[in-house]
């Protein structure tokens, strides 16, 4: 699941090597349909503008990437596939490569932190539910620990 | 909306000053109910463990904070409020302070980036919908710009 990862995945020492290969695979898959859509695109304006690139390079990079992958997989490609079986086949291949990239980025989770759940929070919720009424007392009694967590988080963010 | 922020909010030069004040307000509000829940909590084990603090300090800090605020506001406090009007009043005050903290963190969006939407992506989706069929052709024709965005994002993430 998205929240499951090992320390090895976390470190991702292998990742930089595979990165250019994944992007190359995406570019190659796209080249199979590029001419078709280039011919069909009659408009001069740019859809993916510089402001999108800036979001990719800023605090919202993870969200931008996550949302754009979803946008292509859910909104664009299914509509684009309607242009015949050959195009559909190539787009399926392109979509699979995009999903593989997302899966690898999730696994090496510093690349897509916004898609990962905190395992510690999941554990807190699970323990809370098991404890029933006592869970409420305990969670409220430990609210100051939560404040300490907030403080630690904010101190780290202040660094930037 | 969560995706709306100005350059000023983005820089948040004012924020460090207000931070300790907000945390102090939270601690003060909590002190009003602490003894009550301390007496009620009969269990020795810790709910908010060190692993939670580690998540707050790591890649998943934003998610951990966001989920834990939600957890307290939606799951813990409503159940805790059932212990009479006085407790409810104090908890309402504590909850409001927690919501205010979240609102300020969202506004100064580098503190809660995982809760912000990319305005550029929203714009892409909006333009895509307006263009109808031409939107599909344009989005597919510009898929290589998207790959370039992914590449830039990954290069910047290579940092850590």
């Amino acid at each position: 699941s998205r929240g499951q990862y090992s320390r090895e995945d976390n470190n991702c020492t292998h990742f930089p090597v595979g990165q250019s290969h994944m992007l190359l695979e995406l570019r190659t898959a796209f080249s199979q349909v590029k001419t078709f859509f280039q011919t069909k695109d009659q408009l001069d304006n740019i859809l993916l503008t510089d402001s999108l690139m800036q979001d990719f390079k800023g605090y919202l990079g993870c969200q931008a990437l996550s949302e754009m992958i979803q946008f292509y997989l859910v909104e664009v490609m299914p509509q684009a596939e309607k242009h015949g079986p050959e195009i559909k086949e190539h787009l399926n291949s392109l979509g699979e490569k995009l999903k593989t990239l997302r899966m690898r980025l999730r696994r090496c989770h510093r690349f897509l932190p916004c898609e990962n759940k905190s395992k510690a929070v999941e554990q807190v919720k699970s323990d809370f539910n098991k404890l029933q009424d006592q869970g409420v007392y305990k969670a409220m009694n430990e609210f100051d620990i939560f404040i300490n967590c907030i403080e630690a988080y904010m101190m780290i963010k202040m660094k930037s | 909306s969560r995706g709306q922020y100005s350059r000023e909010d983005n820089n948040c030069t004012h924020f460090p000053v207000g931070q300790s004040h907000m945390l102090l307000e939270l601690r003060t509000a909590f002190s009003q109910v602490k003894t009550f829940f301390q007496t009620k909590d009969q269990l020795d084990n810790i709910l908010l463990t060190d692993s939670l603090m580690q998540d707050f300090k790591g890649y998943l800090g934003c998610q951990a904070l966001s989920e834990m605020i939600q957890f307290y506001l939606v799951e813990v406090m409503p159940q805790a409020e059932k212990h009479g009007p006085e407790i409810k009043e104090h908890l309402n005050s504590l909850g409001e302070k927690l919501k205010t903290l979240r609102m300020r963190l969202r506004r100064c969006h580098r503190f809660l980036p995982c809760e912000n939407k990319s305005k550029a992506v929203e714009q892409v989706k909006s333009d895509f919908n307006k263009l109808q069929d031409q939107g599909v052709y344009k989005a597919m024709n510009e898929f290589d710009i998207f790959i370039n965005c992914i590449e830039a994002y990954m290069m910047i993430k290579m940092k850590s």
Epitope: Q54, K57 | A152
Partner: antibody, heavy 119, light 106 residues
């Protein structure tokens, strides 16, 4: 090792043209976005133009857009800069550089070629 | 366009000194900043990218820090080969270079 070697510089009159070349070796040229950066005598660095790895997209600074054209031939491992309608303010050492990834930093630079625009 | 300033514009120092050069940008560029070293008649050499990681092969006496609009390049103990001009470079929105800091031998 990565090597970038520029050529084609020289003295040219205002309004005339010049074509710079950059021969790349030591890396897979077609896997990298490339750029031209210039430096006027005794001055700082100024980005001129960039091109994506497959030559689909080109980007220019405002002062050269419409006059300069960046291009590449991946089969020859060569980057080009066609400079038309040259002006005195274009006088500079022109460096060919490799982008580490799209729209990010430049990790390797050539030694540069001097272009002098003078009547 | 994003404007960049570097300070000082020049400085004199001795071998073994600790030197700090700062770079300021006119708007938030997050960590999209690189540092280059250039010697007379030579090409610029990449030292640091993404504000702090060291480019492979660059001595560890060089370090970078900062985020947003304020960045720093530090040389912990100057060596004779470090006397050169240093440029910062933002790549968040387009590409801009700082005006440079000339580091001379005292």
């Amino acid at each position: 090792q990565v090597q970038l070697v520029e050529s084609g510089g020289g003295v040219v009159q205002p309004g005339r043209s010049l074509r710079l070349s950059c021969a790349a070796s030591g890396f897979t040229f077609s896997d990298y976005h490339m750029a031209w950066v210039r430096q006027a005598p005794g001055k700082g660095l100024e980005w001129v133009a960039s091109i994506t790895l497959d030559a689909t997209y080109t980007y220019y600074r405002d002062s050269v857009r419409g006059r300069f054209t960046i291009s590449r031939d991946n089969s020859k491992n060569t980057l080009y800069l066609q400079m038309n309608s040259l002006r005195a303010e274009d006088t500079a050492v022109y460096y060919c550089a490799r982008h580490r990834g799209f729209s990010v930093w430049l990790d390797y630079w050539g030694q540069g070629t001097l272009v002098t625009v003078s009547s | 366009d994003i404007q960049m300033t570097q300070s000082p514009s020049s400085l004199s120092a001795s071998v073994g000194d600790r030197v700090t050069i700062t770079c300021k940008t006119s708007q938030n560029i997050f960590e999209n900043l690189a540092w280059y070293q250039q010697k007379p008649g030579k090409a610029p050499k990449l030292l640091i990218y993404n504000a702090s990681p060291l480019q492979a092969g660059v001595p560890s006496r060089f370090s970078g820090s900062g985020s947003g609009t304020d960045f720093t390049l530090t040389i912990s103990s100057l060596q004779p080969e470090d006397f050169a001009t240093y440029y910062c470079h933002q790549y968040y929105s387009g590409y801009t270079f700082g005006p440079g800091t000339k580091l001379e031998l005292k």
